[in-house]
Interface confidence: low
């Protein structure tokens, strides 16, 4: 049987002669040269050679465990004379022994990491990893220990894990943002003679909100004319904040001062400035100076830094209102006046009043804007503002007159203002009622007495307060001996009724009825209208067949045969 132990060979042999591996030996070998040893398998005849007589194996080249740690070969022993094997072919292993010939190599040449500023000591930053190609199962050639070469006292590294942590309290980004840390990985458990590699870790402190906003000055002063409309920007204030991004966002607000209701502050999103704007109309004559307390605050506050103090700052803003020569101001925004339509020329309707609001109290003169009163129906006393008529009025022509009055400062004609005047013309009963339409009707020759042949309606241009109340009657000259009667329905209508049985169209073909229509207002107005009644031949249903004259233009009469 074969006689050998496992073969071991040290890697990276540097000797000048071949490296002895070991001896293949069969217990059948009597040492007389009758046996021949043959080697086959991994590297046989090239890397490994065998003395076929003695079985001694040598390595011809320097071997690298990291390239190939194990070689598997086969051994044969044969009888030189017969060529027959004296041992079964057997597999054996040459194991390459490790030496510490590889330094640790980091997975990255440069690491990049971030950690919030002001982090607690021991806060995780990043983990670095180095690998060593040597044999981890044998000795300490691959046992890596991490240490920090550069970056203390700010950061530390855990020797076994490569975890980098913060090592100093209160690291402030606003003081220093970037750190370059150099980490060494050393094998042999960090002992003397170990091989080492290094890597660079670039660490950036990210911002936290640890700085409040600060106004660079405690007082600001701005001026604005009293004429500034609401929304007008007056000035800009800016607080600075050493933080960045959303931690540097600033919100401005007015927290106190007499101008609290008069002014606003808007945050300009782009510039992070506070824009002071006018909120309500200013009046130099009422108040010339306002003082505001404006606050700048961080909307995104981190509770853990509240101990550093309030994340806000205040400044005083003084606003000086500048005087502007203002136009006169009317006592009302608009005036509504009324006058009867029968008013005589020069009748006073009412008056307007305007005053210069400035301290000078310049006198004012009044005038009518003639573009709004082209017909010069009204006039105004330039001194006292009294409005009076200069022409006769007619409500039925125009109910409302809309005119504009101008008030002008006598000493400064450029300063003027305008006010609308709405003048309502009140109704007077100055129009008579009249027929609503032209009435022409017919009566059948065989009509019976008291038949309704036409209903009358009236209209009136006036507009009495309690509504129209018309009365209808035959004119006095036609009332006696008339062939028809008028029946007043007391509802502003009246009916024409036949007064006799039968009409002869050959005797009288047409009747003209004068009807008096009166209103019941003061003074009473009345008019006379004429109704034409034609006598016609009718069928037994009372339908008109023929009349003495031409065919009726308006056959509006009611059937009388019924």
């Amino acid at each position: 049987s074969w006689m050998w132990n496992q073969f071991f060979l040290l890697e990276e042999y540097t000797g000048s002669d071949y490296q002895y591996v070991g001896k293949l030996h069969s217990d059948q070998d009597r040492g007389d040269g009758s046996l021949k040893y043959i080697l086959s398998g991994d590297g046989a005849g090239d890397l490994f050679i065998i003395n076929e007589n003695t079985g001694d194996i040598q390595a011809t080249k320097r071997l690298d465990r990291e390239e190939k740690p194990v070689y598997i070969l086969r051994a044969q022993a044969i009888n030189r004379r017969t060529g027959r094997p004296v041992e079964p072919e057997s597999e054996f292993i040459i194991k390459i022994h490790d030496i510490n010939d590889n330094e640790p190599i980091f997975t990255k040449e440069v690491y990049t990491a971030t950690v919030p500023e002001m982090s607690d000591v021991g806060t995780f930053v990043v983990q670095v990893t180095a690998t060593d190609a040597d044999d981890p199962t044998y000795g300490n050639s691959a046992k890596v220990v991490y240490s920090i070469l550069q970056g203390q006292p700010y950061f530390s590294v855990e020797s076994e894990t490569g975890i980098i942590k913060t090592a100093l309290l209160n690291m402030d980004r606003e003081n220093r943002e970037q750190y370059q840390v150099v980490i060494q990985a050393k094998d042999m458990g960090g002992q003397m003679g170990g091989l080492s590699g290094t890597t660079t870790v670039n660490i950036t402190l990210t911002d936290v909100n640890d700085n409040p906003p600060r106004f660079p000055q405690s007082t600001y002063q701005f001026k604005t004319p009293e004429s500034s409309p609401p929304g007008t920007p007056i000035g800009r204030i800016k607080a600075s904040d050493a933080d960045v991004g959303e931690n540097a966002e600033i919100e401005y607000s007015i927290t106190d001062g007499e101008g609290l209701d008069m002014f606003d502050v808007i945050t300009d999103q782009e510039t992070q400035e506070g824009i002071i704007t006018v909120k309500k109309l200013l009046d130099f004559e009422k108040k010339k100076v306002y003082t505001l307390k404006v606050e700048a605050s961080n909307p995104h506050v981190e509770p853990r830094f509240l101990y550093l103090g309030p994340f806000k700052d205040s400044a005083t803003v003084r606003i000086v209102v500048e005087d502007v020569d203002e136009p006169p101001v009317f006592s009302k925004l608009a005036y509504i006046l009324q006058i009867r339509e029968d008013a005589q020329i020069n009748t006073t309707i009412g008056s307007v009043t305007a005053q210069d609001p400035d301290a000078a109290r310049n006198p004012v003169k009044y005038s009518v804007d003639r573009h709004t009163d082209m017909d010069r129906i009204f006039n105004i006393d330039s001194g006292n503002g009294s409005i009076f008529t200069s022409k006769l009025l007619d409500r039925e022509t125009l109910l409302w007159h809309n005119i504009t009055v101008i008030a002008t400062e006598i000493n400064n004609p450029k300063q003027s203002s305008r006010v609308p005047l709405y003048i309502k013309v009140l109704d007077v009963n100055d129009n008579a009622p009249e027929f609503a339409e032209f009435y022409e009707t017919f009566v059948c020759e065989k009509a019976k007495a008291d038949q309704l042949i036409q209903t009358l309606r009236a209209v009136d241009k006036d507009d009495p307060y309690s509504g129209h109340q018309f009365s209808f009657s035959l004119a006095p000259e036609a009332a006696s001996g008339s062939n028809f009667t008028i029946q007043d329905n007391k509802d502003n209508t009246a009916g024409i009724l036949t007064r006799k049985n039968g009409y002869n169209r050959h005797e009288m073909s047409t009747y003209l009825l004068p009807v008096v229509i009166s209103d019941n207002d003061y003074p009473v107005q009345s008019s006379t209208g004429t109704v034409t009644v034609r006598v016609c031949a009718c069928d037994h249903h009372g339908n008109m067949q023929s009349c003495h004259a031409e065919a009726l233009i308006h056959p509006t009469g009611l059937s009388t045969g019924a």
Epitope: T114, D207, V244, G245, E246, E249, T267, Q269, E270, P299
Partner: antibody, heavy 120, light 106 residues
Amino acid sequence: QVQLVESGGGLVKPGGSLRLSCAASGFTFSSYAISWVRQAPGKGLEWVGFIKSNADGYTTNYAAPVKGRFTISRDDSKNTLYLQMNSLKTEDTAVYYCARIRYFRNWDYWGQGTLVTVSS
Amino acid sequence: DIQMTQSPSSLSASVGDRVTITCRASQTINSYLNWYQQKPGKAPKLLIYRASNLQSGVPSRFSGSGSGTDFTLTISSLQPEDFATYYCQQGDSSWTFGQGTKVEIK
């Protein structure tokens, strides 16, 4: 003037992927956080996710229904925002808007939207 | 997650009417409440931010109020162009929207 223009929408099968873009102009793009918002047909608005600015470390945050499937990125040199949508589901069908996030956590400018339809 | 509940979900009103929409948060949101208007086929438009601040260019008939959990959007005199859907949005803890209020013509 400020403008946001979305593109890249279209029809995709369930399980598929799509990449939306949002091109910005008229403002300093790199200084602003930008959000993606979506609106399913006939439904209300739903926040998808956002990416902060360079000054805030390009932090991203996502709504629960899309976390792990959608990724927001940006290229400040091109003034462009991206939304990479993977493992799409039928319930992701919506008009997708990008919107500029202003201070005080409101969205002052929006794009016109791009329609994404997920259907087999 | 913070839930936002808007009421009513829809309302009918006439031009000139005063309209009020309310929004309630499931927990306090420190005034980080925004209101948006959206018209069909269009992107939402910011009206009010931080509960009561009028966005630049928005008519003054729109106003917002409230703090903590209860907020209100008021349109003092409804105009024809105001018929739209209105959404509230909280920005205190990530973002969530109300379900919307549709303002229709009566």
